[in-house]
Interface confidence: low
């Protein structure tokens, strides 16, 4: 139930008020408002639509509503000299050329600057060579290359098929390999869902059908000229030399149709498994190069893309708080798209809106919550979180000293099967209560709650009687505020059915077909899944704002610090005699878990039967949920990587997307078999235990009786 | 509807080996993971050992009692789960139960017997 | 390992009773807790997973409630076919364990 006080409200103006002013038709309008044009960052239309969400906003209610903009680093094809991939014959000869665009949908034919399918940031380069099927570019990808099957990428082109893990990765591990270009594409395997027709038709994608995207290794950093400092106007900037997570290598990507020509001609060894194999019909040989008669052809990729300082602008409004005006939860999506943005972002972006509209309604019938709820509409997440990341580093100080929680909004749907949730431990039980008071949107589930349909469809894999919910990982607006600022944070949208749908992601994911009517006439027609979502995102910035408690509960953290911690020893005890050789021990991190069990259950206990009257103690108890997130953070941050300072969970190092626990200790492990001196890579296991049980104890302290 | 079926069970002398076997119907067999849970005559539940899915790399695990000594392994091709039991022991006599994930199905067990 | 203590070992009961049987976890398990009846000569039959909710076809009858390391399985209106035997598991951490069992007898 939601605990909510008298902010100068009537009786009426509690979560249900809220909830029933949300509206599945605005959100069916907001949507197509935001879709009719392309909105890519650093653009004119999308200054244009900050300015239009800046004044709606305003209209809607909010206190204020303020544009902050930046100069930060993007990257555009060229006009004049498009990107595009060859084959050349033994006289240097184009005998095949890829596409240039898409096909546009119907109804989109007459619209102008719609950017051709590229990968943002990818350097110039004109290289040819043979090519070589690396699978997904994952790194066991290419271990089993480079280890099982002996083959050599050094000087290669590589072509990978898009999925299972962040592009980013895929690039970086080709460059390790040695790779001189890579070549990306969407494999019908993983881009095309069975019995499901091609879009318009259907939603599936169709041959000519590209993902765009960055392909930076930013590693939490923000704008690549001005790390760990906002590119504002007085901003030093480093040369693109120094620059965070640039590419080194041109990389492109393509459609399947332009992708079965590449392949259908390659040589070389045989997959080394089904799990090589795509849905083509080509042989999936690996190479290296084409095969006989085709042998003496090469591969020639022509890339003239720029990188350019642009200025982006995020809308930040504000909503203040009546009784703790000082405590920030905050609600962030993106606004950037990288064409018309049927799903990601305007999705969540028009969500978004129907929450601030409702806010706006009920602060407009003398409400106002608890605590001051800030709302934001990011630019350029789509070029590397730019937007999210430069504000937070503008106002670092505050956001660490105020910040209470983080709810992203990006895309409001990825399918329409069931709920997805990665969240904090802290925020487990707040999901869970608010999912049993929502009405589930499933057909087969009327009449009964969000949280019977979303359990039953998406059980926990592990722990019996509770639904999935995820680590997280970044790839989106939130990275900022977990990841760094050890801000509590989480995210919901509706996903698929990831047991009968293995394909990556949406099939249009990024593509010119991700339009209005996608959503309109296959995905969602009633959008009472959009309207599912607002309640849930909006239930939550309401809760975590208004409730007189926080609704966090450490002793769920507690819980998975221990399932993490088992995790980890188990992965170390793959290495026995190492262990012992090395005295490795994981006494410190067990001990430091079952501390924070203890003073968690005690802290729990006080918060049950503390006098809720006196606003001292309750502020007191209320920082102490508030600063427990940020009690995991490092301020040295993880190795190699400063901006990932959280000790319980970081990006994976293999794929951006995935969130790892104890990352520290788990990096420092990952095929250490492989280490040339096993003696200081296992001295840095030991180190990492060290932080990480260190942290974990000085996290439990943050808990105990102040005095 | 979901149904597993173990067989493989049998009298079997100290030291002897035993492979029982559990074909499971009636879901995606490939994304579950398998227990084996055994109960000695009169006796409580034990769990044996646990065999993940291939998202989750096959992973297995045991209990204590029977690691180096027990084998669970899976085909998820022919939706079975195995469970290869080496060095038995008279401790080993029980009935043998398969069950999907945390125990929710189980199966109607079969019965090993170890005895000179 | 974790050790799921079960109280009473056995409880003798008429139809239409209240029936009450706790588990008590050796440490923190969160509410990774389920409940099983089995009966002579069957399989045991999932009642209650994460400590609080009911499976399947399982009558509303049997509730369960409890986190971290108390738990307590509940049968109301004790019906004919509810004479079995009630154990605990966790399923927090490996090894999964179970309590003794619980025999609910006729009185």
């Known amino acids: 139930k939601s605990s909510n006080e008298a902010t100068n409200i009537t009786p009426k103006h509690n979560m249900k008020a809220f909830l029933d002013e949300l509206k599945a038709e605005n959100i069916k309008k907001f949507l197509y408002n935001f879709t009719q044009i392309p909105h890519l960052a650093g653009t004119e239309q999308n200054f244009q639509l900050a300015k239009q969400i800046q004044s709606q906003w305003k209209e809607f209610g909010l206190d204020s509503v303020e544009l902050a903009h930046y100069d930060v680093l993007l990257s555009y094809p060229n006009k004049t000299h498009p990107n595009y991939i060859s084959i050349i014959n033994e006289d240097g000869n184009e005998i095949f050329n890829t596409s240039l665009f898409e096909p546009p949908p119907p109804g989109y034919e007459n619209v102008s600057d719609i950017v051709p399918p590229f990968s943002a940031f990818s350097p110039q380069g004109m290289p040819e060579g043979d090519l070589v099927y690396v699978n997904y570019a994952r790194t066991e990808d290419f271990f089993k290359l480079e280890r099982d099957m002996k083959i050599n990428c050094s000087g290669k082109i590589v072509i990978a098929r898009y999925g299972k893990v962040f592009r980013g990765n895929k690039v970086k591990n080709a460059q390790l390999a040695g790779a001189k270009g890579v070549i990306l594409y969407s494999d019908p395997a993983d881009y095309f869902a069975p019995g499901v027709k091609s879009y318009p038709d259907g939603w599936n994608l169709p041959g000519g059908g590209v993902q765009r995207g960055n392909i930076l290794n930013l590693n939490g950093a923000g704008d690549p000229l001005t790390p760990g400092y906002p590119a504002n106007e007085y901003a030093y900037r480093r040369g693109i030399a120094e620059a965070v997570g640039l590419p080194s290598i041109p990389v492109h990507p393509i459609g399947y149709y332009d992708a079965q020509k590449l392949l259908e001609k390659m040589g070389g060894s045989a997959p080394p498994d089904s799990s090589w194999r795509g849905s083509l019909k080509v042989p999936y040989n690996v190479g290296p190069g084409f095969t006989g008669n085709f042998s003496t052809q090469k591969v020639k990729m022509h890339i003239h893309s720029t990188n350019e300082v642009t200025r982006i602008y995020n809308v930040i409004g504000t909503l203040r708080g009546a009784v703790e005006p000082d405590r920030y939860v905050i609600l962030g999506g993106h606004r950037d798209s990288w064409v018309f943005g049927g799903i990601d972002p305007q999705s969540g972006a028009a969500v978004v809106h129907e929450i601030v509209r409702s806010f706006g309604t009920l602060k407009k019938e003398g409400w106002r919550p608890r605590r001051t709820i800030l709302f934001a509409s990011w630019d350029a997440e789509e070029f590397g979180l730019l937007g999210s990341t430069e504000w937070a580093e503008e106002n670092s100080r505050l956001l660490q000293e105020r910040g209470v929680a983080y709810i992203n909004a990006d895309s409001s749907i990825e399918g329409n099967y069931t709920l997805r949730v990665d969240c904090t431990p802290l925020m487990y039980s707040l999901v869970h209560n608010l999912t049993k008071e929502l009405k589930s949107p499933d057909e087969g589930f009327e009449g009964k709650s969000l949280y019977e349909s979303w359990t039953k469809k998406s059980p926990s894999p592990e722990f019996s009687g509770m639904p999935r919910i995820s680590k997280l990982g970044s790839g989106n607006d939130f990275e900022v505020f977990f990841q760094r600022l050890g801000i509590a944070s989480g995210r919901a949208r509706y996903t698929k059915n990831w047991e009968t749908n293995k394909f990556s992601g949406y099939p249009l994911y990024h593509s010119v077909y991700e339009t209005y009517e996608l959503v309109e006439k296959f995905y969602d027609p009633m959008f009472k899944y959009h309207l599912t979502v607002a309640q849930v995102r909006g239930g939550m910035v309401f809760e975590l704002a208004n409730s007189i408690v926080l609704p966090f509960d450490c002793r769920d953290y507690a819980v998975v610090l221990r399932k993490y911690a088992d995790k980890i020893y188990s992965i170390s005890m793959k290495h026995p005699q190492e262990m012992k050789t090395y005295s490795v021990s994981f006494d410190s991190l067990f001990s430091a878990v079952k501390n924070f069990t203890e003073i968690a259950s005690k802290f729990s206990e006080r918060l049950q039967d503390f006098d809720k009257s006196n606003p001292i103690v309750l502020r007191m108890m209320n920082d102490q949920l508030m600063f427990l997130e940020r009690a995991f953070i490092d301020p040295l941050g993880l190795p190699d990587r400063p901006f990932y300072r959280h000790v319980i969970y970081a990006p994976s190092s293999h794929n951006k997307y995935a969130g790892e626990s104890f990352p520290g200790i788990y990096d420092a492990l990952f095929d250490i078999e492989s280490k040339v001196d096993p003696s200081k890579a296992w001295g840095e296991v030991k180190r990492q235990i060290y932080v990480a049980a260190f942290t974990v104890q000085a996290a439990a302290e943050t808990l105990s009786e102040v005095a | 509807e979901v149904k597993l079926v173990e067989s493989g069970g049998g009298l079997v002398q100290p030291g002897g080996s035993l492979k029982l076997s559990c074909a499971a119907s009636?879901?995606?067999?490939?994304?579950?993971?398998m227990n084996w849970v055994r109960q000695a005559s009169g006796k409580g539940l034990e769990w044996v050992a646990e065999?993940?899915?291939?998202?989750?790399?096959?992973?297995?695990h045991y209990a204590e009692s029977v690691k180096g000594r027990v084998i669970i392994s899976r085909d998820d091709s022919k939706n079975t789960v195995y469970l290869q039991m080496n060095s038995l022991r008279t401790e080993d006599t029980a009935v043998y139960y398969c069950?999907?994930?945390?125990?929710?199905?189980w199966g109607q067990g079969t019965t090993v017997t170890v005895s000179s | 390992d974790i050790q799921m203590t079960q109280s009473p070992s056995s409880v003798s009961a008429s139809v239409g009773d209240r029936v009450t049987i706790t588990c008590k976890a050796s440490?923190?398990?969160?509410?990774?807790v389920s409940w099983y009846q089995q009966k002579p000569g069957t399989a045991p039959k999932m009642l209650i997973y994460?400590?609080?909710n009911r499976f399947t076809g399982v009558p509303s009858r049997f509730s369960g409630s409890g986190s971290a390391t108390d738990f307590t399985l509940t049968i109301n209106n004790l019906q004919p076919e509810d004479f079995a035997t009630y154990y605990c598991?966790?399923?927090?951490?490996?090894?999964?364990?179970f309590g003794q069992g619980t025999k609910v007898e006729i009185k």
């Open positions: 069950t999907r994930r945390w125990n929710n199905f």
């Open positions: 009636g879901f995606t067999f490939s994304n579950y993971w």
């Open positions: 065999i993940r899915s291939q998202s989750n790399n096959f992973a297995t």
């Open positions: 440490e923190n398990v969160g509410t990774y």
């Open positions: 994460g400590a609080s």
């Open positions: 598991g966790q399923s927090y951490t490996f090894p999964y364990t």
